[in-house]
């Protein structure tokens, strides 16, 4: 297993609709054809794999398990979007990238993106 650098933004604020997007960029030492990306959330005394996708370079990412994530890839960048977030989902979201094929296997883990989610205020009742 060889180490690889992964960069991601330090902080992202989710939209009022509970959608947060960020870029996960990895320094690929070679020409990987198969890449696995996993998003982990670290908060509340547990670490949770939020979503994961294995993709062939140039193809779109496919996520399993009714995923709340979507994503696209472009070169050594993965654009990730997490949907359906609520205030309780605020936490550190870590990007983990694995170069699966061809050998050698490379692993890179980012420092994490702190995603802040603010639940929208309910609209006040109106007579209009």
């Amino acid at each position: 297993c060889k180490a690889m650098h992964v960069a991601q933004p330090a902080v992202v604020l989710a939209s009022s609709r509970g959608i947060a997007s960020f870029v996960c960029e990895y320094a690929s030492p070679g020409k990987a054809t198969e890449v696995r990306v996993t998003v982990l959330r670290q908060a509340d005394s547990q670490v949770t794999e939020v979503c994961a996708a294995t993709y062939m370079m140039g193809n779109e990412l496919t996520f399993l398990d009714d995923s709340i994530c979507t994503g696209t890839s472009s070169g050594n960048q993965v654009n990730l979007t997490i949907q359906g977030l609520r205030a309780m989902d605020t936490g550190l979201y870590i990007c983990k990238v694995e170069l699966m094929y061809p050998p050698p296997y490379y692993l890179g883990i980012g420092n994490g993106t702190q995603i802040y989610v603010i639940d929208p205020e309910p609209c006040p009742d109106s007579d209009f």
Partner: nanobody, 126 residues
Framework: KVQLVESGGGLVQAGGSLRLSCSAS????????MGWFRQAPGKEREFVAS????????SYADSVNGRFTISRDNAKNTVYLQMNSLKPVDTALYYC???????????????????WGQGTQVTVSS
């Protein structure tokens, strides 16, 4: 409704290992995340680990991460919890539960789970 039956608990010395099993009957659980929780005497039920429907995603409590491993065999309708390097603080009644969804960010909360087993006792002596 799914019936869940846990087994594999027992008395073990600190540093030892146990493998818990949870068998499901009734409706298949292949489309649902599965979780393990535990409850020590006088304490609230707490999250231990969870595994997504496909088996590709996991969630672990910090206190067990690196020591416990959750896995599942959908063909056998069974979920497992491999517990290594056990500590006296791991002593509790361990429950298996079926999540109502394939996966979510709230898999560590009890309200996400519809069906529960009766539990299997794990005692770790020093």
């Amino acid at each position: 409704k799914v019936q869940l039956v846990e087994s594999g608990g027992g008395l073990v010395q600190a540093g030892g290992s146990l493998r818990l099993s949870c068998s499901a009957s009734g409706r298949t659980f292949a489309n649902n995340a599965m979780g393990w929780f535990r409850q020590a005497p006088g304490k609230e039920r707490e999250f231990v680990a969870s595994l997504s429907a496909s088996g590709s995603l996991t969630s672990y409590a910090d206190s067990v991460n690196g020591r416990f491993t959750i896995s599942r065999d959908n063909a056998k309708n069974t979920v497992y919890l491999q517990m290594n390097s056990l500590k006296p603080v791991d002593t509790a009644l361990y429950y298996c539960a079926r999540n109502r969804r394939a996966w979510s960010l709230s898999v560590h909360t009890t309200r996400e789970y519809d069906d529960w087993g009766q539990g299997t006792q794990v005692t770790v002596s020093s």
